[in-house]
Amino acid sequence: LIIGFGISGRHSITVTTVASAGNIGEDGILSCTFEPDIKLSDIVIQWLKEGVLGLVHEFKEGKDELSEQDEMFRGRTAVFADQVIVGNASLRLKNVQLTDAGTYKCYIITSKGKGNANLEYKTGAFSMPEVNVDYNASSETLRCEAPRWFPQPTVVWASQVDQGANFSEVSNTSFELNSENVTMKVVSVLYNVTINNTYSCMIENDIAKATGDIKVTESEIKRRSHLQLLNSKAS
């Protein structure tokens, strides 16, 4: 969380951003809030990116003002217009690209003053893993698959029964480049699986951490998966 204070003739206003990550090819949100004003006409929101000449987005007098917008963001940005009046300046970024990563500034002017805060935006790919029993294998085998990751993650297996055990000798992980030549499909196989145990396949890079759990008993199979972004720091 980054909190910025502005300096003005009246008083500075507090602007708060939250560092976040974008999943390439999908839509992302750059989060920014500010002390609300009571009238829309006096609110100006400017999003800027370090190293980019034009603006990322500008909203003023109740409308998008995109004449100064940089080419790389053309047609890809929007504010939540109905939420501006309650202090939400967050930016929706469509079709996130790897090159969207960097330092952004959320700059706010209201009738009460000015303020700004920076935001670190990381980009990559992350997806939920699915763990299944591989019935084609000769021994009891689990297969963990996640369709899109970038940068290349690490994969670690764990088990509830053998806590702290190292499964690197009995697992095999491969990374297959997807058709767009950036993201990769992650496949990890765990051998010599015992019944009545819960296994976890943990995939992690510097952007996200995802876990796929599977519990195999003689009567049923239970699955659960979870994904967590690693860098949600407020500013």
Epitope: H11, E35, P36, I38, K39, L40, S41, E61, G62, K63, A81, D82, Q83, I85, V86, G87, K112
Partner: antibody
């Protein structure tokens, strides 16, 4: 859940003052504007003023400057509006209303102020 | 001061009919218009914010449209509980102002 509870009805003589309270609960009182709105009998709605309890910033409708004074006490999450030099045309229901997720999304039940000699 | 003019002042309709309420601003207010419903003895209730966003819990027979100076609240099929007074309000500039109201009454 968000609630705004206003003080009870008041009957005042011309020239007197009255202070209406609005106790807020269910949200962060200091983070949102609190407004006051007047509705005279059989009439429409009229915005009086607003206060941002986080820093006591106020905005007044010019028409009510000198008539209304608004304050907020953050320790009790209560907003106040004092009306001075009361006249018969100040007879009205006064509402407090806040803007949490949308404009005027929560309202108090209203306080009837009657000015009569 | 931005003046909001609502029309008609009174709308006499039967349950099941469509109601179209108009609100015209004296200057451009972008999308900064909200609509409220008020019944006798009650506080106003938010229906539509920012011209077209239906507030939580408001039935989908209520819809708002418009931007700039012309705004419309539409009730697609009137229910008995919809007979009330409706106000538009702008938050584009101060002083914040309300329209004079439209009373929707049973024909």
């Amino acid at each position: 859940q968000v609630q705004l509870v206003q003080s009870g009805a008041e009957v005042k003589k011309p020239g007197a003052s009255v202070k209406v309270s609005c106790k807020a609960s269910g949200y962060t009182f200091t983070s949102y504007w609190m407004h006051w709105v007047k509705q005279a009998p059989g009439q429409g709605l009229e915005w009086i003023a607003a206060i941002y309890p986080g820093n006591s910033d106020t905005d007044y409708n010019q028409k009510f400057k000198g008539k209304a004074k608004i304050t907020a006490v953050t320790s009790t999450s209560t907003a106040y509006m004092e009306l001075s030099s009361l006249r018969s045309e100040d007879t009205a229901v006064y509402y407090c209303t806040t803007t949490v997720a949308h404009y005027f999304d929560y309202w108090g039940q209203g306080t009837m102020v009657t000015v009569s000699s | 001061e931005i003046v909001l003019t609502q029309s008609p002042a009174t709308l006499s309709l039967s349950p099941g009919e469509r109601a179209t309420l108009s609100c015209k601003a004296s200057q451009d207010v972008s999308f900064a218009v909200a609509w409220y419903q008020q019944k006798p003895g009650q506080a106003p209730r938010l229906l539509i914010s920012s011209a077209s966003y239906r507030y939580t819990g408001v039935p989908d027979r209520f819809s708002g449209s418009g931007s700039g100076t012309d705004f419309t609240l539409t009730i697609s099929s009137l229910e008995p509980e919809d007979f009330a007074v409706y106000y538009c309000q702008q938050h584009y500039n101060t002083p914040l102002t309300f329209g004079g109201g439209t009373k929707v009454e049973i024909k």
